[in-house]
Amino acid sequence: IWELKKDVYVVELDWYPDAPGEMVVLTCDTPEEDGITWTLDQSSEVLGSGKTLTIQVKEFGDAGQYTCHKGGEVLSHSLLLLHKKEDGIWSTDILKDQKEPKNKTFLRCEAKNYSGRFTCWWLTTISTDLTFSVKSSRGSSDPQGVTCGAATLSAERVRGDNKEYEYSVECQEDSACPAAEESLPIEVMVDAVHKLKYENYTSSFFIRDIIKPDPPKNLQLKPLKNSRQVEVSWEYPDTWSTPHSYFSLTFCVQVQGKSKREKKDRVFTDKTSATVICRKNASISVRAQDRYYSSSWSEWASVPCS
Amino acid sequence: RAVPGGSSPAWTQCQQLSQKLCTLAWSAHPLVGHMDLREEGDEETTNDVPHIQCGDGCDPQGLRDNSQFCLQRIHQGLIFYEKLLGSDIFTGEPSLLPDSPVGQLHASLLGLSQLLQPEGHHWETQQIPSLSPSQPWQRLLLRFKILRSLQAFVAVAARVFAHGAATLSP
């Protein structure tokens, strides 16, 4: 058993049929010695008396808010949550496996630049009685500070018969060094509580590996005289790290016909302009990637050819 | 020559070679199914790598103030990786494919390190016993780890030379 926060405790249980469970001793936080009784949740049934209460925690029916009273007055509470371990593996019932970029990916994180700011998100089908708490650090043995905000519900989607809820959190490294080569990964830890079930999820990454620039901005076409060619120009996204002479991007320019089956013409360039042939009813799209490190491409910025 | 001891480096030459290094490092080890090599733990095999850290003067302001400190650090890393790529980690079994970019990568590391030969002091690397795994599968894993680490290192070096070529060239 360990303390998650004040008056909230997590009992770690090996979860299999007829498991013996865990013996837990609760102590009433009071100077009083006599006339103390214990109850669980909203029930008025007295579970025991005395300053301590010993219980055998085996299942969710044994978890909940234990309260000690004296003469109708509440003295203190202890909330017991369960963390299930099945076949040596901690349960992951609360969050959905996003399966990208690999199986057992529950947390996904992205950064728009090298400032040390990043966003993580996760999915669940649970809509109520759900709380999240997020902690992060750079490295684990001698951790350096990363400050995370509160997790918030950022999107709701309907998937077949189910509703899916996306939660996200923003974090900022306290003493970020954008130009340095990271040698210690960022660690992100999410505590999830659904009713009386506790689970924790972790992710470990370098900022460089989760970079995904915003799409290029101000995408414009300039027709060239007496030609089917056009000059496409764009700018670095505002959110990208500066100076651009140091934090450089490379770009992919694509000409795509109306039909998805039509052949795509692609040009790669380090410049912020390119000359392409604009076909009727086609569109021109540009996306960006770090020039020197192959992290994710941005989403496409697009304009119609006409 | 780009000398991290006094005179100004050949920024444009260094920029071209460092950008080539980035391309080679990624073609030598593309992201194969997102292998998470950090899960293997950071044992003694790769932990004496000269990382470009915050105080090394490789940020735009540090380069403007005095680029020599950063160039010395980059030089350290280049000779470290050059030694690793020439060691039995890469020359031993399993043999690299004949068209593997590792040979080119090794030569380019050497080329850039010679461009950056520092004045005033000299760095060398020593092969440490723990850097020579006996099993081919260990060697393969170590190659991946070294190449992933090299990708991060040359990315910073390339940014430094690109910025230098754009803003610090005479």
């Epitope: - | 850290q53 105080g55 650090r73 092969q127 440490i128 723990s130």
Partner: nanobody
């Protein structure tokens, strides 16, 4: 905080040898780069040699390369500087220093955190 104590200095004739030791206490140095620097009267402190945490990387100033050898024994929390073929221009106070931010140290004295009190080396002609 790391405390460093140098020893082994003294008066020696040109062409002679000395072995300097630097014993660290208060913190294990096995994860940090270590360096030797020297300062002659009226001159700036200058880099002599440095060694990485696991001895994989070693640096020497051009003026001592081939004559001096830096080494370390992490089990003993000690760094050594073997000085051979000493010259009068090697006369200086020799300082040991720890780069507590790096496994692979630099040649920049300002990057080193822990410094010893120094040991005097005098080479007579």
């Amino acid at each position: 905080e790391v405390q460093l104590v140098e020893s082994g200095g003294g008066l020696v004739q040109a062409g002679g040898s000395l072995r300097l030791s630097c014993a660290a206490s208060g913190r294990t140095i096995s994860n940090y780069g270590m360096g030797w620097f020297r300062q002659a009267p009226g001159k700036e402190r200058e880099f002599v040699a440095a060694i990485s945490a696991r001895s994989a990387m070693i640096g020497y100033s051009d003026s001592v390369k081939g004559r001096f050898t830096i080494s370390r024994d992490n089990a003993k929390n000690t760094v050594y500087l073997q000085m051979n073929s000493l010259k009068p221009e090697d006369t200086a106070v020799y300082y040991c220093a720890a780069d507590l931010n790096r496994r692979v140290p630099t040649a920049r004295p300002q990057e080193y955190d822990g410094w010893g009190q120094g040991t005097q080396v005098t080479v007579s002609s």
